[in-house]
Interface confidence: low
């Protein structure tokens, strides 16, 4: 008995071939001997089976002695043995229809679980193997679960169902909803405008939800909500914004925030959360702001940074085109009685300059100029 595997919702074509290469009488029946379809001369006739509207054949092939049964929009319950009667002989084909679905929405938040459920006909014992977009293989029976979805799990999952040495392949598109970066850091000199960007790692046309940026300034004892906003389709509308600092927000995606100026009191870290409509849980992105200030007070030239710096970052003060006068793994460095000229304050990581501020030291009778 020939075995054919089909996919729920698809179309299958069961073949039946006569030895005579001409149009002769044929019938397709199911295992209950109920006629599905056949011919009367050049006409297609249909029987009382439940397949009625979904069953068809290819009249163009009858003259070649081919009498296929086409079943459209396959259902699991179409799984059966189909019998083709032609030339006093019977050809039996066993059709097994499988369905594979994500038992939740195919748009899932990062960290959530994905469960794939296999629908199969009674009596079948299929095995399933799925390959994620990043090449990870998972195997299972009727259900497969993947916990803690990551950004790289976004894309097409290819699942192969194996039964009677035959296989059928399913493709399921999974979208992991997340920000492109889990964390970002912005380095700014005092007084500069600050741009924060929160690009999403997915594109869906209809994106509705609400969000908030909570900020923990290094100098503050508690965190504070800086801005709340709504998202409707690709449109962002600000609900509430603090007066100090007065953030500005772009009206379209990607989410974009502008801080009018960097100040030591703003240095710290923030957490932008985005709650999407019809989704449990929230998307998160951490953002950090490091602010640098160089000042000269009387005979003391000082450079300071505020915000979440790593212990390996180096802060240096040097006279332009000269060796560093002072270099420390600290958040403040200073030089007493600095000589006149253009001084540079540098924040660097393994030799790479992250932030630079220049201050001009004038001869002792003048006041300093900050460019």
């Amino acid at each position: 008995k020939k075995v054919v595997l089909g996919k729920k919702g698809d179309t299958v074509e069961l073949t039946c071939t006569a030895s005579q290469k001409k149009s002769i009488q044929f019938h397709w029946k199911n295992s209950n001997q109920i006629k599905i379809l056949g011919n009367q001369g050049s006409f297609l006739t249909k029987g009382p089976s439940k397949l009625n509207d979904r069953a068809d054949s290819r009249r163009s092939l009858w003259d070649q002695g081919n009498f296929p049964l086409i079943i459209k929009n396959l259902k699991i319950e179409d799984s059966d043995t189909y019998i083709c009667e032609v030339e006093d002989q019977k050809e039996e084909v066993q059709l097994l229809v499988f369905g594979l679905t994500a038992n939740s929405d195919t748009h899932l938040l990062q960290g959530q679980s994905l469960t794939l459920t296999l629908e199969s006909p009674p009596g079948s014992s299929p095995s399933v193997q799925c390959r994620s977009p990043r090449g990870k293989n998972i195997q299972g029976g009727k259900t497969l679960s993947v916990s803690q979805l990551e950004l790289q799990d976004s894309g097409t999952w290819t699942c192969t169902v194996l039964q009677n040495q035959k296989k059928v392949e399913f493709k399921i598109d999974i979208v992991v909803l997340a920000f492109q970066k889990a964390s970002s850091i912005v380095y700014k000199k005092e007084g500069e405008q600050v741009e924060f960007s929160f690009p999403l790692a997915f594109t869906v046309e209809k994106l509705t939800g609400s969000g908030e940026l909570w900020w923990q300034a290094e100098r503050a004892s508690s965190s504070k909500s800086w801005i709340t906003f709504d998202l409707k389709n690709k449109e962002v509308s600000v609900k509430r914004v603090t007066q100090d600092p007065k953030l500005q927000m772009g009206k379209k995606l990607p989410l974009h925030l502008t801080l009018p100026q960097a100040l030591p009191q703003y240095a710290g870290s923030g957490n932008l959360t985005l709650a999407l409509e019809a989704k449990t849980g929230k998307l998160h992105q951490e953002v950090n702001l490091v602010v640098m200030r160089a000042t000269q007070l009387q005979k003391n030239l000082t450079c300071e940074v505020w915000g979440p710096t790593s212990p390996k970052l180096m802060l240096s003060l040097k006279l332009e085109n000269k060796e560093a006068k002072v270099s420390k793994r600290e958040k403040a460095v200073w030089v007493l009685n600095p000589e006149a000229g253009m001084w540079q304050c540098l924040l660097s990581d393994s030799g790479q300059v992250l932030l630079e501020s220049n201050i001009k030291v004038l001869p002792t009778w003048s006041t300093p100029v900050q460019p």
């Epitope: 690009p199 409707k232 389709n233």
Partner: antibody, heavy 118, light 111 residues
């Protein structure tokens, strides 16, 4: 399949208004932005503006800001582009378009020729 | 506004040869690793047809003879090999910021 079908050609006098329609089918109308683009005979393409059919929020090219109104009727899956105070240099084929999966306009209406002549 | 310039204005290529069209943007159209530049083909009396989106992604159903490259402000559309029915005008378009803008077009003729 996705289809955008536009209204027929129009002949207008200078100073008049024209309203071109674009009927969408084959997808959920409120899910996608409808854009309007025009092309004068033998010339290049010029973006007029866009509408979010779900919210009715419209954005237009500042060049047309005072003269263009883009609207959408969710009940009929139709977007409209109205251009007022027509001038002879508004003579062009007006297209509606929709994004595909990427950022480009993958689906276009057949175009509506608007002729402005005294 | 971002202005796009295309070169050459017109181009005559023999079948089987390579055609290269460039598009220059007045400012960078890059955002977070993606370049928001698209390419279209337009034949007389027809609406434009999307060939390439986000600088290098081939639109579904478009032959692999068409390819796009570039980032920042400089982009290229390549047709290799050119076929008879590639006679058309080709436009670049930025979808980085409003107002969205198209290049002036490059007319490609098959010799």
């Amino acid at each position: 399949q996705v289809q955008l079908v536009q209204s027929g050609a129009e002949v207008k006098k200078p100073g008049a208004s024209v309203k071109v329609s674009c009927k969408a089918s084959g997808y959920t109308f409120t899910d996608y932005v409808i854009h309007w683009v025009r092309q004068a005979t033998g010339q290049g393409l010029e973006w007029i503006g866009e509408i979010y059919p779900g919210s009715g929020s419209a954005y237009s090219n500042s060049k047309f800001k005072d003269r263009v109104t883009i609207t959408a009727d969710k009940s009929t899956n139709t977007a409209y582009m109205e251009l007022r105070s027509l001038r002879s240099d508004d003579t062009a084929v007006y297209f509606c378009a929709r994004r595909g999966n990427g950022t480009g306009f993958a689906y276009w209406g057949q175009g509506t020729l608007v002729t402005v002549s005294s | 506004d971002i202005v796009l310039t295309q070169s050459p204005a017109s181009l005559a290529v023999s079948p089987g040869q390579r055609a290269t069209i460039t598009c220059k943007a007045g400012q960078s159209v890059d955002y977070d690793g993606d370049s928001y530049m698209n390419w279209y083909q337009q034949k007389p009396g027809q609406p434009p047809k999307l060939l390439i989106y986000v600088a290098s992604n081939l639109e579904s159903g478009i032959p692999s003879r068409f390819s796009g490259s570039g980032s920042g402000t400089d982009f290229t559309l390549t047709i290799n090999p050119v076929e008879e029915n590639d006679t058309a005008t080709y436009y670049c378009q930025q979808s980085y910021k409003d107002p969205l803008a198209f290049g002036p077009g490059t007319k490609v003729e098959i010799k």
